[in-house]
Interface confidence: low
């Protein structure tokens, strides 16, 4: 049956559509296309006579149609008006007519939508906000996104106006999010830019910090107030009901008992017009003077200097206490206390002795603590480390090396290439490197206070061709069922893929095999003797590839239960007894024999010439592997019969 297929069925304005004819009859005279669902001469688009291969435009021809010999019709530069039905009228050679109708729909390419809002600054728990997706477009579907997620289910969210409008009722601060709308039709989909909803809220009840309400005379009172609010709250402080200042922090130095009282923080949001207050009661107690620490050396050098810390002031009949890192003093031969505990001496300071150090004076009610003191211990530089760890680079990349050495004061850095000074910076940057940038890169770290210098040298290779890799191993002789082995493919190179082969094959799937470190490291857990294979690693990048020489894993195993051969256990008197013992083992085991429990020789083969019934008994082979530390043994019974007696039969009476 003659049919028409529209490709595509949904067409975008400006694109093209092909009305494809299926099952076209044989022996045709010609055919004609019409706009609409029936043959109407006034709506003829084009006719085609096969014999003359002549196409004749009709009244509905727009110049955008092309007819093909197979009767298919291509319509280009589609417009909205092209939507609808198209009828093909086929005239066969016997002048019998046949018709088929097809159709397609035309949709516009959607513009990028935008969001309009009826309220740019809604107030929490009070206002509603209506977002509208512009423009209004026929036959379009509207979708909404919140923080790039589809709309959550919420009774406060309502879609209306064919989903063009999204209304948020009773907005909350949690509605502060990124909103997007999307328009879709069968031929296109467009998403708007984000609109961020700015919800005005607060202030919430303010919190005053710190929480402690008891202070000593002479301390500083430093109170801070915070209230969640948008826009940020304006703060005012009141002491005993009297206005003090309009700041978020209230600072009163060197307080006295007279500063006791009620402290009120008021938070005000000018946009919402709301005020909230919080009150705290502060009590100030009279106390003795606060202790402090003096030092005889403010910049001691590590492993060289001693430091004496003294707790001031000196007060008769007073107990002095010390803390390091907020803990009581540790027991250490490098820490010494004077007889009155007032002076703490650190012998031969290290960088770990920075502290903080506090001293305290015991009085009737409590302990007064000094401010903490931190020692500025000069140390280093330690050996510098150069990062990243790559030693191989491809030409054309940027070389960016960073040097770091632990040091106080911070080290000053210098870079040398092949011994030539380059620059005095912590970082070395060379853009678009070439093979000529290969060389020895030295970082020198210098501590200006101690005068000490340390250097680290790194070899950098720049090559388009990858070097031949090599395999390093953390265990050259692993023991079976005990050890793990980690193979690492060297060198570490930038933008490089690492591959592994075992006995020329790609890695088998095994829970005992694990790749890590960007496939640079292959770990074999719980090795077995079957892992004693040839391992090869390969490196490749976009321009070259290379493989390492094979590394064969030498797995130590055994000794397994030995086997004594030959298997015979019955012999005739006068025969030679020649027993051989074998046990699977790496390295080869040491062998020893016992006959009836008596040690014999340390050989793999036991030979006894012309045996007699006296040689009856138990023959035990012992095997020992010194590398694995394991032993094994087997026992065999040997029966020797007198000549002329068949083995296995007893003599007649």
């Amino acid at each position: 049956k003659l049919t028409i297929e529209s490709t595509p069925f949904n067409v975008a304005e400006g694109k093209e559509v092909l009305l494809l004819v299926h099952n076209l009859p044989q022996h045709l005279f010609g055919y004609s296309w019409y706009k609409g669902e029936r043959v109407d001469g006034n709506r003829q688009i084009i006719g085609y006579v096969i014999g003359t291969q002549q196409a004749t435009p009709g009244p509905a021809y727009s110049g955008r149609e092309i007819i093909y010999p197979n009767a298919s019709l291509l319509i280009q530069n589609i417009i909205q008006n092209d939507t609808g039905f198209y009828t093909l009228h086929v005239i066969k050679s016997d002048l019998v007519n046949e018709e088929a109708t097809g159709q397609f729909r035309v949709y516009p390419e959607l513009p990028k939508p935008s969001i309009s809002s009826n309220n740019s600054k809604p107030v929490e728990d009070k206002d509603a906000v209506a977002f509208t997706c512009e423009p209004e477009t026929q036959d379009a579907t509207y979708l909404w996104w919140v923080n790039n997620q589809s709309l959550p289910v919420s009774p406060r969210l309502q879609l209306s106006n064919g989903n063009r409008t999204l209304t948020l009722f009773n907005v909350t601060r949690n509605d502060t999010a990124s909103y997007k709308c999307e328009t879709q039709n069968p031929v296109s989909a467009r998403r708007s830019d984000s609109v961020i909803l700015n919800v005005l809220y607060g202030p919430d009840a303010p919190t005053i910090s710190p929480l402690n309400t008891s202070y000593r005379s002479g301390e500083n009172l430093n109170l801070s107030c915070h209230a969640a609010s948008n826009p940020p709250a304006q703060y005012s402080w009141f002491v005993n009901g009297t206005f003090q200042q309009s700041t978020q922090e209230l600072f009163i130095p060197n307080i006295t008992v007279n500063n006791s009282g009620s402290y009120t923080c008021q938070a005000h949001n000018s946009d919402t017009g709301l005020n909230r207050t919080t009150v705290t009661t502060i009590t100030v107690y009279a106390e003795p003077p606060k202790p402090f620490i003096t030092s005889n050396n403010s910049n001691p050098v590590e492993d060289e200097d001693a430091v004496a810390l003294t707790c001031e002031p000196e007060i008769q009949n007073t107990t002095y206490l010390w803390w390091v890192n907020n803990q009581s003093l540790p027991v250490s031969p490098r820490l010494q206390l004077s007889n009155d505990n007032r002076t703490l001496t650190l012998l031969s300071v290290t960088r770990n002795d920075v502290g903080p150090y506090e001293c305290g004076i015991q009085n009737e009610l409590s302990v007064d603590h000094s401010d903490p003191v931190i020692l500025n211990v000069l140390y280093g530089p330690d050996d510098p480390t150069i990062s990243p760890s790559y030693t191989y680079y491809r030409p054309g990349v940027n070389l960016s090396l960073s040097c770091h050495a632990a040091s106080n004061p911070p080290a000053q850095y210098s870079w040398l290439i092949d011994g030539n000074i380059q620059q005095h910076t912590q970082e070395l940057f060379i853009s678009n490197i070439t093979e000529k940038n290969s060389g020895l890169y030295t970082c020198q770290a210098n501590n200006s206070a101690s005068g000490h210098s340390r250097t680290t040298v790194k070899t950098i290779t720049v090559s388009a061709e990858l070097p031949k890799p090599s395999i390093s191993s953390n265990n050259s002789k692993p023991v079976e069922d005990k050890d793990a082995v980690a193979f690492t493919c060297e060198p570490e190179a930038q933008n490089t893929t690492y591959l592994w082969w075992v006995n020329g094959q790609s890695l088998p799937v095994s829970p005992r095999l694990q790749l890590s470190n960007g496939n640079r490291t292959l770990t074999l857990f719980n090795v077995t003797r079957n892992d004693a294979r040839a391992y090869v690693c390969g490196i490749q990048n976009s321009v070259s590839a290379n493989r390492s020489d094979p590394v064969t894993l030498d797995v130590l195993y055994g000794p397994d239960t030995p086997i004594i051969s030959p298997p015979d256990s019955s012999y005739l008197s006068g025969a030679n007894l020649n027993l051989s013992c074998h046990s699977a083992s790496n390295p080869s085991p040491q062998y020893s024999w016992r006959i009836n429990g008596i040690p014999q020789q340390h050989t793999q083969v036991l030979f006894i010439a012309k045996i007699t019934p006296n040689n009856n008994g138990t023959y035990a082979c012992f095997v020992s592997n010194l590398a694995t530390g394991r032993n094994n043994s087997i026992v065999k019974s040997i029966t020797v019969s007198a000549s002329g007696t068949s083995p296995g039969l007893s003599a007649g009476a």
Epitope: Q423, T425, I430, S431, N432, I433, T434, K436, N437, G439
Partner: nanobody
């Protein structure tokens, strides 16, 4: 980020002068070499001149010797090319490039500035 921004190009009559500037950022020109490379339609790229502030050396192509002068102001991190007695064959796009301190190979180019010498 390393950046090189050239300026100072334009249209000039034969025999005239121009001064090209190259403002560098993301690195110190005193730690490297900086050069001027020109590219004219149908011609090979040519390294016109370069200067290595860290060692105080300058180089010039034979075609510009005595006419062009390269200089650098390390305090402004800027390099200059003073071009005198300009000829029609000097017409090209002039690029400022970092020259590696190791091998003198110009390997990081700016966007270029056009110099046209025509009557």
């Amino acid at each position: 980020e390393v950046q090189l921004v050239e300026s100072g190009g334009g249209l000039v009559q034969p025999g005239g002068s121009l001064r090209l500037s190259c403002a560098a950022s993301g690195f110190n020109i005193k730690d490297t070499c900086i050069g001027w490379v020109r590219r004219a339609p149908g011609k090979e790229e040519e390294l016109v001149a370069d200067i290595c502030p860290y060692k105080g050396s300058t180089r010039y192509a034979d075609s510009v010797k005595g006419r062009f002068t390269i200089s650098a102001d390390t305090s402004k991190n800027t390099a200059y090319l003073q071009m005198n007695s300009l000829r029609a064959e000097d017409t090209a796009v002039y690029y400022c490039a970092i020259v590696s301190a190791r091998d003198g190979y110009y390997n990081y180019w700016g966007q270029g500035t056009t110099v046209t010498v025509s009557s």
